[in-house]
Interface confidence: low
């Protein structure tokens, strides 16, 4: 006796290793989503003794947007935080097509690594759609193969060069929170840049070294944007 | 009340010894005193997962009893507002053994401050 394919759970996938009776399987929330505390991802193939038919138990799982991606974190003084409103999913998949009962693509809420440079943060965020890519992911504790898929990146950077556009989740508003300290630091940096400039006029040999060092730093004030920095994230915006 | 919570936790630990529950649960292993109520609520929520996945009546009853005891103890402290604490889903997922050990630690924290 075997079980049919398990039921679909919103924002989750399941990779069934065995359809046999008493097999216990786990759903895994899609990347960018996490299992809601208090809910179980477990489903078990059980036998209905009255009908002699095997079926999967209903998991109580609810996958919610990863709060680490949703929250507008308290930003360091030099940071301009860009955030958007997470929409309520109206249908089970953004394309309007409904997902199949089970899908072999299951990846854990991936631990995505990114080089975080001072003054800017890359925050992974994934819309409920499939076929997007992920920078790096780890296998789930249950041995489910992770899929190398695309992740959308939101740039939370102090650069105010954020290109206009709609976020993959459908965010149309961009809320920019600028702390007083940021304004002050902006002023100070302008003064320091001016000082550098004046200094460079007086001592040319040293200036070239110092200016190179300045340019090597990540764009913190949005004065001269390095294309490759924004390229990694702006194509999704 | 918190002492009874500890004994219920020990009972749950004993009961799950014979079971294979491979769940990983959101666990705060380093509770900051200013976030202990928030952390406790996460532990209580995740305890329900053990109950759900065990399918065992004794565990279910013990969990239910523990939650009632803990909630009573929390409410007797009055409404505590904690801010800047991690949400449950931001915590690390750990196996049941580590989860229960950390749970005992946080309960002891409440005992020490009550």
């Amino acid at each position: 006796i075997t079980c049919p394919p398990p039921m679909s759970v919103e924002h989750a996938d399941i990779w069934v290793k065995s359809y046999s009776l008493y097999s216990r399987e786990r759903y895994i929330c899609n990347s960018g989503f996490k299992r809601k505390a208090g809910t179980s991802s477990l489903t078990e193939c059980v036998l209905n003794k009255a009908t002699n038919v095997a079926h999967w138990t209903t998991p109580s799982l609810k996958c919610i947007r990863d709060p680490a991606l949703v929250h507008q974190r308290p930003a360091p003084p030099s940071t301009v935080t860009t955030a958007g409103v997470t929409p309520q999913p109206e249908s089970l998949s953004p394309s309007g097509k409904e997902p199949a009962a089970s899908s072999p693509s299951s990846n854990n809420t991936a631990a995505t690594t990114a080089a975080i440079v001072p003054g800017s943060q890359l925050m992974p965020s994934k819309s409920p759609s499939t076929g997007t890519t992920e920078i790096s992911s780890h296998e789930s504790s249950h041995g489910t193969p992770s899929q190398t898929t695309a992740k959308n990146w939101e740039l939370t950077a102090s650069a105010s060069h954020q290109p206009p556009g709609v976020y993959p989740q459908g965010h149309s508003d961009t809320t920019v929170a600028i702390s007083t300290s940021t304004v002050l630091l902006c002023g100070l940096s302008a003064v320091s840049l001016l000082a550098c400039y004046l200094k460079s006029r007086q001592t040319p040999p040293l200036a070239s070294v110092e200016m190179e060092a300045m340019e090597a730093l990540p764009v913190t004030w949005g004065t001269s944007s390095r294309d490759e920095d924004l390229e990694n994230c702006s194509h999704h915006l | 009340n918190w002492v009874n919570v500890i004994s219920d936790l020990k009972k749950i630990e004993d009961l799950i010894q014979s079971m294979h529950i491979d769940a990983t649960l959101y666990t705060e292993s380093d509770v900051h005193p200013s976030c202990k109520v928030t952390a406790m609520k996460c532990f209580l929520l995740e305890l329900q997962v053990i109950s759900l996945e065990s399918g065992d009546a004794s565990i279910h009853d013990t969990v239910e009893n523990l939650i009632i005891l803990a909630n009573n103890s929390l409410s007797s402290n009055g409404n505590v507002t904690e801010s800047g604490c991690k949400e449950c889903e931001e915590l690390e997922e750990k196996n049941i053994k580590e989860f229960l050990q950390s749970f005992v630690h946080i309960v002891q924290m409440f005992i020490n401050t009550s």
Epitope: S8, K36, G38, S60, K62, E98 | -
Partner: antibody
Framework: EVQLVQSGAEVKKPGESLKISCKVS????????IGWVRQMPGKGLEYMGI????????RYSPSFQGQVTISADKSISTAYLQWSSLKASDTAMYYC???????????WGQGTLVTVSS | EIVLTQSPGTLSLSPGERATLSCRAS???????LAWYQQKPGQAPRLLIY???RRATGIPDRFSGSGSGTDFTLTISRLEPEDFAVYYC????????FGQGTKLEIS
């Protein structure tokens, strides 16, 4: 045993407010959705909306959006359906039902008959 | 919004006969999201089939569900006296829609 027990029948006048309840037992209230379904006399079933008591995430059917309010009280494992101003057309049997996660309604309450008449 | 149309509106059969109830969706529905319910007079609905073909706990094996895409069927292989009731199909998921019902009556 999973049980959903609804409050008793109500007779109201148009314009009055009303809140009916659905008390659950036998499972963890916060981990399953609770839906509300209307059945007008001699008619079929109409889906009204659904709530996830764990975080009060509520979704309404477009036909009922703004007409009713769905809420839940975790402390007493009870879901509610309320009207601020009843109309004669609200006369119906109202059922609460447990939704397995985004799945069908596997357990139902016995129903609450609401009669609105002047 | 998906519209579910059930046919026939009323089906008159005798105990022992086979009943076939149809549910047609206005657009394709994943079979994972189709359920059938039975409702007897004065009672709450009862889940029979979910996922188009999976019997709910305690439902006799004379009830079976089939179909995919836009056409779904509930079959009662051999009618028992207690099977005469109204049957509803439902599309569930992030939006829930019921069909208008099929009344199964004794002829």
């Amino acid at each position: 045993e999973v049980q959903l027990v609804q409050s008793g029948a109500e007779v109201k006048k148009p314009g009055e407010s009303l809140k009916i309840s659905c008390k659950v037992s036998g499972y963890f209230f916060t981990t399953y959705w609770i839906g509300w379904v209307r059945q007008m006399p001699g008619k079929g079933l109409e889906y009204m909306g659904i709530i996830y008591p764990g975080d009060s995430d509520t979704r309404y059917s477009p036909s009922f959006q703004g007409q009713v309010t769905i809420s839940a009280d975790k402390s007493i494992s009870t879901a509610y359906l309320q009207w601020s101003s009843l109309k004669a057309s609200d006369t119906a049997m109202y059922y609460c039902a447990r939704g397995g996660n985004w799945n069908c309604f596997d357990y139902w309450g016995q129903g609450t008959l609401v009669t609105v008449s002047s | 919004e998906i519209v579910l149309t059930q046919s026939p509106g009323t089906l008159s059969l005798s105990p022992g006969e086979r009943a076939t109830l149809s549910c047609r969706a206005s657009q394709s529905v994943s079979s994972s999201y189709l359920a059938w319910y039975q409702q007897k007079p004065g009672q709450a609905p009862r889940l029979l089939i979910y996922g188009a073909s999976r019997r709910a706990t305690g439902i006799p094996d004379r009830f079976s569900g089939s179909g995919s895409g836009t056409d779904f069927t509930l079959t009662i292989s051999r009618l028992e006296p207690e099977d005469f009731a109204v049957y509803y199909c439902q599309r569930y998921g992030s939006s829930h829609t019921f069909g208008q019902g099929t009344k199964l009556e004794i002829s």
